[in-house]
Interface confidence: low
């Protein structure tokens, strides 16, 4: 069993002959007469375990000790402390020539925990051991202990274990401690990255490069190595581990950021305050959530602030121009906190008689310079029928717009452009053809650009080639034409007219008169 | 008025895997995150984590990892907790509670409903 | 993880006295506290919130103090139904743990 002492944390012990309680038990030879274990009382008034020798009368001593088997645990290179008193031999009458100041440290490695004999011709030595300060009998009355103290090391070792042996040749020795330790790198944190308890080299000028593994909550920026040295030193630091995102350096540590923080990369930044209109609730927050109503951009940092879509332009009017309008606005009260605002014109045809039923006024509509993302406050929209409701809308928006469930960012106005000549009528029928007369019937023009006041029908004999052509006008989309010649080709023309003036005649439409007296209904656009 | 209906009591043996409902009414929904709650037998009570009901990711507090799933339907307002391969010491009353996934205004958190809890009982 | 340590475990008391009952957490939480009655087999209710506020429909007698690690939830003069069973939880970094509890009996 063995009792605890304290030692350097760069020191790990494989043996301490003073935390053994009860007999050490080690082997000497001869079996008596030499090296025997005797109890003293330490400094502390403790009881210890020691192996004293002290046959300085008779010469050629060679008296052997050995420990128990020590496994090395890795160690390549060990130390052996040895902390002992040596009678000076000049305080001894009588011994001169006998007595000895110094004994031998040797060692023997083996994979055997159960040797139980030494053979001296296995043991290779370490160092020959002379006492640096010697003690008399009277210090021994006083209780005080000279003791000396001396530090060896051994090595490369190879085997599971080994053997230490202490030989005296004639000396007056008590071996009060004995410690066997390797050295180590212990367990250390520097730029985040931890690197393990490591055994040192072989020798002692060797550097064991170690590479370290990042702290909890870190990753890698440049590859951590230390240099372990032979002293059980951390040597010459390389690289470092930077925190995680959503944590911070603190104490050595990546500790997560507080509620109300955040960190968005791995950096060595501490975490930032949650910047305006927003927040975060629990700790290691990367990114802090928008407030109620506010919204994040896809390319705004996380570090922006909270933005909101802006609120309507102000001050829209209008300006018609025939089948034209410019449109001119103001910026936003509330931008919404960004630099990004931007304005898109929505354009919608309605029905006179109820302006609710709207629909999208169609591509065949311009816009100078454009319909979106207008830089300015200002837009000239073209191609616009004529006599036609229109609603314009001119939205607000900016880089968070589309996050908005519920948009109410926009202005709009409702004019009526000016009437303008209707287009030319698409389609003239001959409904009825007798010897004397044509009815005809015709459609309403495509666009009829204001209100139709009257049809305006021309007519003449083919072969006259419009030489010599009749009129007639009626406010209906139909008309009799009377009084023509039997067996005859006419040609017919129809426009349409508002207050803006006549439109286009319509294609002519081509009707021979009939010479028996019947009827001949027709609805083509030739009637023969 | 604001209310959460939890389902009914269970009896179950060892190894079997048991469903518990969290049906909420009266709010909308997604405003707020479900949090759940586990009471052993003349026990305190032991918050077990939530689950945010606009994505639908779970948090499990450390005790929760593995058998124990939180899932949603948000068709039907309903929060769901599953418990696998039962054990003895999963015998315990089961509240679910809301709290605001947004602040308001105020900075602090707190259950303001509980649903009625649900016993589930495990036992051979 | 912060630890919530409630006293007294019980206590038993007359109506019209005066309760007080104390929460302890293991380190600074920022007035992140509410504290609820439960009844038995009933779910926990609300009483209080950010350590001093009080919630909606809870009479005017209890009340809440305190601030870093330790608070206070007093019953000025208690009521038959206020023989229950009262947590306090703290909101300050997950787990959100409660209290063990305090029973408070009809002496």
């Known amino acids: 069993v063995t009792g605890s002492r304290v030692y350097p944390a760069n020191e790990v012990t494989l043996l301490d002959s003073r935390s053994v309680q009860g007999e050490l038990g080690w082997i000497a030879s001869p079996l008596e007469g030499g090296w025997e274990e005797v109890s003293i009382m330490d400094e502390k008034n403790t009881p210890i375990r020691t192996y004293q020798v002290c046959n300085v009368m008779e010469p050629s001593q060679n008296n052997w000790l050995r420990t128990d088997w020590i496994t090395r645990e890795g160690a390549q290179r060990v130390y052996i402390e040895i902390k002992f008193t040596l009678r000076d031999c000049n305080s001894l009458p009588g011994v001169m020539g006998t007595c000895k100041e110094t004994f031998n440290l040797y060692y023997y490695e083996s994979d055997n925990d159960k040797e139980r004999f030494i053979r001296e011709n296995q043991f290779v030595k370490i160092d020959t051991i002379a006492a640096d300060e010697s003690f008399t009998q009277v210090d021994i009355g006083d209780r005080i202990m000279k003791l000396n103290t001396e530090i060896r090391d051994v090595g490369p070792l190879s085997k599971k274990g080994f053997y230490l042996a202490f030989q005296d040749v004639g000396a007056c020795i008590a071996l009060v401690s004995v410690r066997v330790f390797y050295k180590k790198c212990p367990l250390t944190v520097r730029n985040l990255a931890q690197f393990p308890d490591t055994i040192t080299g072989a020798d002692t000028s060797s550097l064991v490069e170690v590479r370290g593994s990042c702290v909890n909550n870190s990753e890698e920026k440049d590859v951590p190595k230390m240099y372990c040295g032979a002293d059980g030193e951390w040597l010459v630091p390389i690289g470092n581990c930077l925190c995680n995102a959503g944590h911070e350096e603190r104490s050595g540590e990546c500790q997560a950021c507080k509620i109300g923080y955040y960190k968005a990369l791995s950096t060595d930044a501490t975490c930032a305050k949650c910047p305006p209109h927003s927040y975060s609730v629990w700790e290691g927050a990367t990114s802090c959530t928008c407030d109620r109503g506010f919204f994040r951009a896809d390319n705004d940092a996380a570090s922006m602030p909270c933005t909101r879509p802006p609120s309507a332009p102000l001050n829209l009017i209008s300006n018609v121009n025939e089948t034209s309008v410019n449109l001119e606005w103001s910026s936003p009260q509330n931008t919404g906190g960004r630099q990004d605002i931007s304005y898109n014109v929505v354009c919608k045809k309605c029905g006179a008689g109820d302006p609710s039923k709207c629909r999208p006024c169609g591509s065949g509509v311009h816009y100078t310079p454009q319909q979106n993302g207008l830089k300015t406050t200002k837009v000239s929209i073209t191609d616009l029928l004529a006599h036609t409701n229109y609603t314009f809308e001119i939205w607000a928006v900016n880089g968070v717009s589309k996050y908005n469930p519920n948009p109410d960012q926009s202005v709009s106005v409702t004019v009526t452009t000016n009437q303008a000549a209707p287009s030319s009528i698409a389609l003239v029928q001959a409904k009825e053809v007798t010897r004397y007369s044509v009815a005809l019937a015709w459609l309403e023009p495509d666009r009829p650009n204001g209100v139709i006041l009257e049809y305006e029908v021309k007519y003449y004999e083919k072969d006259q080639n419009e030489r010599s052509y009749r009129i007639v006008r009626t406010a209906a989309r139909n008309t009799d034409i009377k009084g023509l010649n039997p067996l005859t080709s006419y040609v017919f023309h129809v426009r349409a007219r508002t207050a803006a003036g006549y439109g286009d005649f319509s294609e002519p439409l081509e009707v021979t008169t009939n010479t028996v007296p019947s009827r001949i209904i027709g609805d083509g656009a030739n009637s023969t | 008025q604001v209310q959460l209906v939890q389902s009914g009591s269970e009896l179950k043996k060892p190894g079997a895997s048991v469903k518990v409902s969290c049906k909420a009414s009266?709010?909308?929904?997604?405003?707020?995150?479900m949090h759940w709650v586990r009471q052993a037998p003349g026990q305190g009570l032991k918050w077990m984590g939530w689950?945010?009901?606009?994505?639908?990711?779970?948090t499990y507090a450390q005790g929760f990892t593995g058998r124990f799933v939180f899932s949603l339907d948000t068709s039907v307002s309903t929060a769901y907790l599953q418990i696998s391969s039962l054990k003895a010491e999963d015998t315990a009353v089961y509240y679910c509670?809301?709290?605001?996934?947004?602040?308001?205004?105020?900075?602090?958190?707190?259950?303001?409903?509980w649903g009625q809890g649900t016993t589930v009982t495990v036992s051979s | 993880d912060i630890q919530m340590t409630q006293s007294p475990s019980s206590l038993s008391a007359s109506v019209g006295d005066r309760v007080t009952i104390t929460c302890r957490a293991s380190?600074?939480?920022?007035?992140?506290l509410a504290w609820y009655q439960q009844k038995p087999g009933k779910a926990p209710q609300l009483l209080l919130y950010a350590a001093t506020n009080l919630a909606d429909g809870v009479p005017s007698r209890f009340s809440g103090s305190g601030s870093g690690t330790d608070y206070t939830l007093t019953i000025s003069s208690l009521q038959p139904e206020d023989f229950a069973t009262y947590y306090c939880?703290?909101?300050?970094?997950?787990?959100?743990?409660f209290g063990q509890g305090t029973k408070v009996e009809i002496k």
């Open positions: 509670a809301r709290i605001p996934l947004y602040y308001y205004g105020s900075r602090y958190w707190y259950f303001d409903v």
């Open positions: 380190e600074n939480i920022y007035r992140n």
């Open positions: 939880q703290h909101f300050w970094g997950t787990p959100w743990t």
């Open positions: 689950i945010n009901t606009e994505t639908g990711e779970p």
């Open positions: 009266g709010y909308t929904f997604t405003d707020y995150s």
